[in-house]
Interface confidence: medium
C-alpha cells in the first residue's frame, strides 16, 4: 500500500556537542517493522542510518556517523521512528532526508538541522 512520509516542518536546532532527535513517520500509520527505514544526507545520499531486515545496519553508515546515531523504534509498529544523533558537530548542519521503503514503494521527507555554538554570545549594550 502507499503512504506519505512526514517529518518536522521547521528546522530543528541543536547545540554543538549535544544530542538531537529527528522524528519521522508514515501516514496513514502502519507497522513499519518489516520496512527499510533510513536517513541520508542529500544530494548524493550518504547513509546516516539504515534499518533493514529488522535490524540496524551499522556497518553501512558513512564513517562520520558511525557510533553517533541511534534509531528509536518504540513506535515503529505505528510507523513512527526517531533518529537520535549524539555529539552534534557543525558539519551536521543542513539537510537530512528520512525514507521508508516497503518492497518497491519508497517515500521520503526532507528536514533541516541547524547547529549552534553553545559558547557564542553577544555582550549586552
Amino acid at each position: 500500500g502507499q503512504f506519505r512520509v512526514i517529518g518536522p516542518r521547521h528546522p530543528i536546532r541543536a547545540l554543538v556537542g549535544d544530542e538531537v532527535e529527528l522524528p519521522c513517520r508514515i501516514s496513514p500509520g502502519k507497522n513499519a517493522t518489516g520496512m527499510e527505514v533510513g536517513w541520508y544526507r542529500p544530494p548524493f545520499s550518504r547513509v546516516v542510518h539504515l534499518y533493514r531486515n529488522g535490524k540496524d545496519q551499522d556497518g553501512d553508515q558513512a564513517p562520520e556517523y558511525r557510533g553517533r546515531t541511534e534509531l528509536l523504534k518504540d513506535a515503529i509498529g505505528e510507523g513512527k521512528v526517531t533518529l537520535r544523533i549524539r555529539n552534534v558537530r557543525f558539519s551536521d548542519e543542513g539537510g537530512f532526508t528520512c525514507f521508508f521503503r516497503d518492497h518497491s514503494y519508497q517515500e521520503e521527507a526532507a528536514m533541516e538541522l541547524k547547529v549552534e555554538d553553545p559558547f557564542y554570545w553577544v555582550s549586552p549594550g
Epitope: 545520499s45 539504515l50 553508515q61 564513517p63
Partner: antibody, heavy 118, light 108 residues
Framework: QVQLQQWGAGLLKPSETLSLTCAVY????????WSWIRQPPGKGLEWIGD???????NYNPSLKSRVTMSVDTSKNQFSLNLNSVTAADTAVYYC????????????WGQGTLVTVSS | EIVLTQSPATLSLSPGERATLSCRAS???????LAWYQQKPGQAPRLLIY???SRATGIPDRFSGSGSGTDFTLTISRLEPEDFAVYYC?????????FGGGTKVEIK
Amino acid sequence: QVQLQQWGAGLLKPSETLSLTCAVYGGSLSGYYWSWIRQPPGKGLEWIGDITHSGSTNYNPSLKSRVTMSVDTSKNQFSLNLNSVTAADTAVYYCARRGIGAAVFDLWGQGTLVTVSS
Amino acid sequence: EIVLTQSPATLSLSPGERATLSCRASQSVSSSYLAWYQQKPGQAPRLLIYGASSRATGIPDRFSGSGSGTDFTLTISRLEPEDFAVYYCQQRSNWPLTFGGGTKVEIK
C-alpha cells in the same frame, strides 16, 4: 579521489558463471550502495542490483534467480556472479556507486565486456 | 516496473544549436528521483542531472533539466562539439531502478 576499477573473465560459454570484481580505491565502502549495471552492445542500460558494506543486497527481479553479489570489506571490493549465462547476457558490465536515497550513479568503473559464445 | 521512453531516438543537430530531449515515464515519477546521464563511445556513463533539475558537480550550465509527473526534459542550450553523445534518463521512484532507451545526439 575515489575510483572504481573492475576486472573479470571476458569470454564465457553458455551455462557458465560470469564473475566480476570491482575495487574501490581512495574511499570507503561505507555510506553508499555499490551497484552493477550492464549494457548489451548498441543497447541501453540495465540495473542488475547492488550491495552495501554489510552485505545487504537489492536485485533486479528480472535477474534475481541467477545473481549473487558479495562484498569483501578487508579488500574494499565487491563482486558479481551471474550463473547459467546465455548469449543474451553478452554486454558491457559496469560497477558503480549510488546513494541510498536519490539512487543516482555518481561514480562508475571503466566497464568490462563479457561475451557469451559457444 | 516503470518504463522510461526517450524520444527522439536520434537527434541530428549542428554545434551551437539547442537540443531538447524527452523522457516519458509509464507512471508518475517524483521529480526528486529522475536523473540524466551522458555516455560517449567506449566510456562509462557520466551523471549530468539529478533530482530532475540539479546539475552534478562540474557539469556546465548549458545543460538543464525540467519536468514533473510523467514528462521530463533535458535541454542543452548551445551544443558544443563534446556534447555529441548518447543521453539516458533514469528513475528511482519505484523499484527496480530503470533507465530509458537513450537518445543519440549526432552531428548534422
